[in-house]
Interface confidence: medium
């Protein structure tokens, strides 16, 4: 008997288990149901978020003064939802507002045109006019007093600029956790601000919601380019896989309805449509907690958190015990009479059924190697299921996985044992060498920027046991190639890039980790004032000084794609030293000069330029 | 093809004892969470029981709750609701049902009548 007709059993089910977490009663006003779900303070700041991100250019006050009246108009339709324009969609209403902007056409060029068009189509010009790298100045950060002060006078400018100029900064960052990165941000200068020693209590705090927020924003941006540039069955396979692994005692069923109900959240938030989507991320926590028992034994700290910390530290969670006595998955994905029969008559329930079996089964293994051995297999069997013998031929299906599972694991080795000898600031440097071999023509300040957080990796992961390295080291990998692949798809210059990102979203690794030198690159002219350097470099940060080195270093691989690891060092020695050396002169800016002439007659000597 | 077999239903008295059991083919038994559901005469349907994949965990419906005990055997492919303490209000045609990935379900068995009466 099928079980169609007997849907009103379904409504009897006490658990919420069978009730989609998001169904919702029809609502007059969609602005007023979401004010009144959010509450004003949440509603005005993710507004705020919303706008700074589409339009990443206007003033702090002009963005406050237009949430400002979206509020105020929101509270009208609470009050009433009949009253005029609060039947309107969150996309009509904030689009209206935004096209209201005066300076439109001047700050933004071509985005201006976006307000001639109708929704959906207005708003998705919007989302296509996002830019991962807008050209605003580096956030200076003032003395702790001038700080306090600020906060003190006006905590809730302060709190809204911080959102605003991270917002604006990072137009995908997840608007949900922003809201929770804000709440440390003001927990940290409520605490700080009353201590005695104000700047070591603060700057530390400061920084480290600086990188995590980095982090956050970088992660956030990769399953929304997976959304939107390989559609929602490339991220459902990666949220399988993911959750799979960190849920493993969960049965499949409900593994595939998180799947579903975080697919919404994040396809709602990478579309900007921020309300609904802290809407729904809240009632997805509230779900996980209400069926921890079905989902995981690592739960019970989160959920007795706020909602904010709640919904983070469920994102964050360890993996789970896996289940005892795990039967082989050979019986039903290769012994089986029934494989192909099970594949044809439901393709992605089946290959999700092989992906939530081996993930849970393969904590140790990275997300992206769980999805190419589930392509791999898939691949097979739809050779195999229209072969004379199917089960013949995809008999040593599960052989073909070794290299793929081997290849990661070399590359891990080989790398931390490079991190381990070199230590953090050489690694990246090797890599600064490496990729700048590989792909010349990416502009030099995006080579530095990848290569210093690819070679972050060493001290982020090899310290991990061997059990933790891999997903660890390979699932971060692709979160900062694809940092590469967004700023590359702004101003394309390389092909090979472009292959790279575009192909295979979880073969972006391995597409990257093949490539050879580029033969056909034409080095680029010797100009030395790319290595002229000021005495303002000694009142650098010693980051800051990294950079600048590494920047030299780039531009020294431009010119000389072909200089041997032997020849570069012995330039880049040359450099720190000369460095040193005048930060060290009582007239500093005259030893920059003199000795710089010097240095670069050499390095080009030592490179034969 | 998907089957369930529930054989076993039958007449019992008050206060007495009765285990169902329910035989699964044309699917792989293990992956699925299981459950019974009821119908009594003249009533809707009401949920029972249900019983994850691996066995470890279980839902009741709480007019059932610490009289009836699912459980299953993924070598056998069968499930089983052992029922004591049974009462009058017991009485009810009692189906077998595989869940699909919501956690609905889609298939269920014939059902198996169990009347409690003295």
């Known amino acids: 008997m099928k079980w169609v007709t007997f849907i009103s059993l379904l409504f009897l089910f006490s658990s919420a288990y069978s009730r989609g977490v998001f169904r919702r009663d029809a609502h007059k006003s969609e602005v007023a149901h979401r004010f009144k779900d959010l509450g004003e303070e949440n509603f005005k700041a993710l507004v705020l978020i919303a706008f700074a991100q589409y339009l990443q250019q206007c003033p702090f006050e002009d963005h406050v003064k237009l949430v400002n009246e979206v509020t105020e108009f929101a509270k009208t339709c609470v009050a009433d939802e009949s009253a005029e324009n609060c039947d309107k969609s969150l996309h009509t209403l904030f689009g209206d507002k935004l096209c209201t902007v005066a300076t439109l056409r001047e700050t933004y060029g071509e985005m201006a045109d976006c307000c001639a068009k109708q929704e959906p189509e207005r708003n998705e010009c919007f989302l296509q006019h996002k830019d991962d790298n807008p050209n605003l100045p580096r956030l200076v950060r003032p003395e702790v007093d001038v700080m306090c002060t600020a906060f003190h006078d006006n905590e809730e400018t302060f709190l809204k600029k911080y959102l605003y100029e991270i917002a604006r900064r990072h137009p995908y960052f997840y608007a949900p956790e922003l809201l929770f990165f804000a709440k440390r941000y003001k927990a940290a200068f409520t605490e700080c601000c009353q201590a005695a020693d104000k700047a070591a209590c603060l700057l530390p705090k400061l920084d480290e919601l600086r990188d995590e927020g980095k982090a956050s924003s970088a992660k956030q941006r990769l399953k929304c380019a997976s959304l939107q540039k390989f559609g929602e069955r490339a991220f459902k396979a990666w949220a399988v896989a993911r959750l799979s692994q960190r849920f493993p005692k969960a049965e499949f069923a409900e593994v595939s309805k998180l799947v579903t109900d975080l697919t919404k959240v994040h396809t709602e938030c990478c579309h900007g449509d921020l309300l609904e989507c802290a809407d729904d991320r809240a009632d997805l926590a509230k779900y996980i907690c209400e069926n921890q028992d079905s989902i995981s034994s690592k739960l019970k700290e989160c959920c007795e958190k706020p909602l904010l910390e709640k919904s983070h530290c469920i994102a964050e969670v360890e993996n789970d015990e896996m289940p005892a006595d795990l039967p082989s998955l050979a019986a039903d994905f290769v012994e089986s009479k029934d494989v192909c029969k099970n594949y044809a008559e439901a393709k992605d329930v089946f290959l999700g059924m092989f992906l939530y079996e081996y993930a849970r089964r393969h904590p140790d293994y990275s997300v992206v190697l769980l999805l190419r051995l589930a392509k791999t297999y898939e691949t097979t069997l739809e050779k195999c299921c229209a072969a004379a013998d199917p089960h013949e031929c995809y008999a040593k299906v599960f052989d073909e996985f070794k290299p793929l599972v081997e290849e990661p694991q070399n590359l891990i080795k080989q790398n931390c044992e490079l991190f381990e000898q070199l230590g953090e600031y050489k690694f990246q440097n090797a890599l600064l060498v490496r990729y700048t071999k590989k792909v010349p023509q990416v502009s030099t300040p995006t080579l530095v920027e990848v290569s210093r957080n690819l070679g972050k990796v060493g001290s982020k992961c090899c310290k991990h046991p061997e059990a933790k390295r891999m997903p660890c080291a390979e699932d971060y990998l692709s979160v900062v190639l694809n940092q590469l692949c967004v700023l590359h798809e702004k101003t394309p210059v390389s092909d090979r890039v472009t292959k790279c990102c575009t192909e295979s979203l979880v073969n972006r690794r391995p597409c990257f980790s093949a490539l050879e030198v580029d033969e056909t690159y034409v080095p680029k002219e010797f100009n030395a004032e790319t290595f002229t350097f000021h005495a303002d470099i000694c009142t650098l940060s010693e980051k800051e000084r990294q950079i600048k080195k590494q920047t030299a270093l780039v531009e020294l691989v431009k010119h000389k794609p072909k200089a041997t690891k032997e020849q570069l060092k012995a330039v880049m020695d040359d450099f720190a030293a000369f460095v040193e050396k005048c930060c060290k002169a009582d007239d500093k800016e005259t030893c920059f000069a003199e000795e710089g002439k010097k240095l670069v007659a050499a390095s080009q000597a030592a490179l034969g330029l | 093809e998907v089957q369930l077999l529930e054989p076993g239903g039958g007449l019992v008295q008050p206060g007495g004892s009765l285990r169902l059991s329910c035989t699964a083919s044309?699917?792989?038994?293990?992956?699925?969470?299981m459950g019974w559901v009821r119908q009594a005469p003249g009533k809707g349907l009401e949920w029972v029981s249900w019983i994850r994949p691996d066995g470890t965990f279980t839902y009741y419906a709480d007019s059932v709750k610490g009289r009836f005990t699912i459980s299953r055997d993924n070598s056998k492919n069968t499930l089983y609701l052992q029922m004591n303490s049974l009462r009058a209000e017991d009485t009810a045609v009692y189906y077998c049902?595989?869940?699909?990935?919501?956690?609905?379900?889609?298939?269920w068995g014939q059902g198996t009548l169990v009347t409690v009466s003295s």
């Open positions: 049902a595989k869940s699909y990935l919501s956690g609905t379900f889609d298939y």
């Open positions: 044309g699917f792989t038994f293990r992956h699925y969470r």
